[in-house]
Interface confidence: medium
């Protein structure tokens, strides 16, 4: 922001009324009036270029310093070319000297040169040559100097002529302030510019109404430079929740709009399934039947729990069931749908039912499922199972009602035994098997059927209550087809896969485990 100038002295604006002191009195500097652009202007002028040594002083009136620390002196003046006078005026000069003196009181007409300190020699950039003078072209020079720090109540300026033809048209003395400023929604007060060029005065800003320093943010600060310019902004304020930035102020969100936190963003329109908000809203309430999960941003539409899974099938495969379903037709407006599967088993004879989570095995954890299928195994044969698939989303916990679909299935067979070859010789094969423990209690005996590969006319059967058997009197180096089947009170269970096991050849005899 541009520096603000506070004028302490303005000769041009005073219309010749200031009555500055000239020394020696009645010689040298003289107050003159001229016409420029059809307007009368006043100037202090001296032109003793032919008279040898000159020491003519012009002193301003006493200027009250006030709060100024560094003053700026702007001079507008014209200087005639020494060559424009006959014979070049050998004693003619083209510069003059600028002085100042500080004091706590006005000395009036008591002028003492020794009290003055030289600021600088003032030289023109352009001198007025004869042709310009004759044509009334005033070659106006502008020079600026600064002095500081000032400490006394006031000061004088003085101009020393040493034999130039010069006219002072304007003497303006001012100090600089960093102007009152609104930046980053912070207000910075008008601040006097410091006196030392390298130093920057740190000024704390205050947030405008309804603005705050964001959490973890820096307090607003600016630096007031010596030239009255604000520099190096640090930190900022943001419009608080319910308010948005409009130019340099925070304005309440309009009805139907909201802003949920202090940020640079504008107010947003209330999302779908919300009630119209009042002015200055930080959020928009949900319509009846719609909810907002704790982690949902305020900008998200309100949502509701999903409907039940659309279509559920249970396909039995021995002692396993594959459950498949399709997503709910109404997601409730959310994408965070998960499924939970629960299981209930019923005994056909007694009609008694109970949960079966402990006795069955799921292909993946049955709660928080994101896929739409799961396999349930370790089911007991000759048992009725009811499976419930519930659809839930982020707001399901906010209501008591549930959205689920059920499917029932009856298990008539045990699961096929898993068969392993434990050992073999030239004439025997040792075979073992297993079935899920929950089904074991329902198995009466196991039936092992075996035959030579390629011989479809004859086969052998062995029954046992255990989980293994050794098949003897076999031919060496021969492949046998082996299958194990559980027998229950209700009949046969599911048979295992048909396995191919080979006896050893006579050369490689010995009972080797495989």
């Amino acid at each position: 922001a541009q520096g603000k100038e506070v004028v302490l002295l303005d000769f041009a604006a005073a219309g010749g009324e200031l009555g500055w002191l000239t020394h020696p009195y009645g010689k040298g500097w003289d107050l003159m009036q001229n016409i420029m652009n059809d307007m009368p202007i006043y100037m202090y002028s001296v032109c003793n270029v032919m008279s040898g040594d000159q020491d003519n002083w012009l002193r301003t009136n006493w200027v009250y310093r006030g709060e100024a620390e560094r003053i700026f002196i702007e001079l507008k003046f014209t200087v005639r070319d020494c060559n424009s006078f006959p014979g070049g005026a050998s004693s003619c000069k083209e510069t003059f000297n600028l002085y100042y003196a500080e004091s706590d009181l006005d000395y009036g007409t008591n002028f003492q040169k020794r009290l003055f300190t030289k600021i600088d020699t003032i030289a023109p950039d352009e001198i007025t040559v004869s042709s310009d003078f004759e044509a009334r072209h005033v070659k106006l020079n502008v020079e600026e100097r600064s002095v500081g720090p000032l400490t006394r109540k006031g000061f004088y300026l003085a101009f020393q002529d040493i034999g130039a033809c010069v006219a002072l048209l304007s003497v303006r003395v001012y100090y600089k302030k960093c102007p009152e400023l609104l930046q980053g929604l912070a207000h910075f007060p008008e601040t006097i510019a410091g006196s030392d060029a390298p130093s920057l005065a740190t000024v704390a800003g205050t947030c405008v109404d309804h603005a705050v320093v964001p959490p973890g943010g820096e307090e607003p600060r600016m630096h007031c430079a010596v030239d009255g310019e604000w520099l190096v902004p640090i930190g900022q304020c943001l419009c608080q929740a319910g308010y948005e930035k409009v130019e340099d102020a925070c304005q309440a969100c309009s009805p139907g709009f909201f802003k949920f936190e202090a940020s640079e963003s504008p107010c947003l329109e209330c999302p779908e399934h919300t009630l119209p908000s009042p002015e200055g809203a930080t959020s928009c309430e949900c319509e009846e039947g719609f909810f907002r999960a704790p982690q949902d941003p305020a900008s998200m539409p309100c949502t509701r729990p999903p409907s039940a899974p659309h279509y559920l099938t249970a396909v039995g495969m021995g002692a396993k069931v594959e459950l498949r379903w399709t997503p709910p037709q109404d997601s409730g407006g959310r994408e965070d749908i998960v499924y939970s599967v629960t299981c209930e088993q019923c005994w056909p004879e007694s009609g008694e039912c109970g949960p079966c989570e402990a006795s069955v095995r799921y292909s993946e954890p049955p709660h928080g499922l994101t896929r739409t299928s799961v396999t349930v195994s370790d089911l007991e044969p000759h048992m009725n199972y009811t499976f419930t698939v519930e659809a839930r989303n982020g707001v399901s916990g906010l209501v008591t009602s549930r959205s689920f679909r059920t499917a029932s299935v009856s298990i008539n067979q045990t699961e096929p035994p898993k068969v392993r070859l434990e050992g073999r010789s030239t004439t025997s094969l040792s075979v073992s098997w297993s079935i899920p423990p929950p089904q074991q209690s329902r198995v009466w005996k196991y039936e092992v059927t075996y035959r030579k590969k390629g011989d479809s006319n004859s086969y052998n059967v062995r029954r046992t209550e255990g989980f293994s058997v050794t098949l003897d009197d076999l031919a060496p180096d021969t492949t046998y087809l082996v299958q194990v089947q559980a027998l229950t009170q209700e009949g046969q269970g599911a048979g295992s896969k048909v396995h191919e096991f080979q006896t050893l050849s006579p050369e490689g005899s010995g009972n080797l485990a495989v």
Epitope: M32, M50, E134
Partner: antibody
Amino acid sequence: EVQLLESGGGLVQPGGSLRLSCAASGFTFSHYMMAWVRQAPGKGLEWVSRIGPSGGPTHYADSVKGRFTISRDNSKNTLYLQMNSLRAEDTAVYYCAGYDSGYDYVAVAGPAEYFQHWGQGTLVTVSS
Amino acid sequence: DIQMTQSPSSLSASVGDRVTITCRASQSISTWLAWYQQKPGKAPKLLIYKASNLHTGVPSRFSGSGSGTEFSLTISGLQPDDFATYYCQQYNQYSRTFGQGTKVEIK
């Protein structure tokens, strides 16, 4: 020594024309503002017209505006005044006058000029 | 235009007298005023410019003063060569105007 010598005056009938000349010597003519000043018999001085050192700008008294034309030829060191539509009240001695700012010890020139050097004058009589 | 009024229109004085002629402007002209001397049948001669500055070669018995609207020409110790008509002229405006003249005669 500065010398200005007017010529071209004489008797002329009302409505007639006359051209006055002023020959300059003894100074750098092209540095000077030049002017014509007249004096009716037994009366005071009246400024008529001026011209800048290089031929412009030119100014005229209201009483002659549109009838008189001032000009100069710096190569010939000569000033002219072309007078048309002459009237009886134009009867006067016409002086050519010059001003050189080098002799004017002021920092800023006055809005107009005064006259440092004068010719001896030439009489113009307008009569029927 | 600015009107210039001189007074008196004529005066009689003796050699050695101190003579003052005044010139009044109809509006302020700062110090943009010149004084001329004219003898019968001759061209005017510049005496003073910028109200108080003596033109080159003019005797120091001539002096000028004043600013704004009131000006004066003083001859301190009148000499025989000084009997003439004196004119003031303003050059604050391009329509430079002269006073009507003051004739200084021998008493």
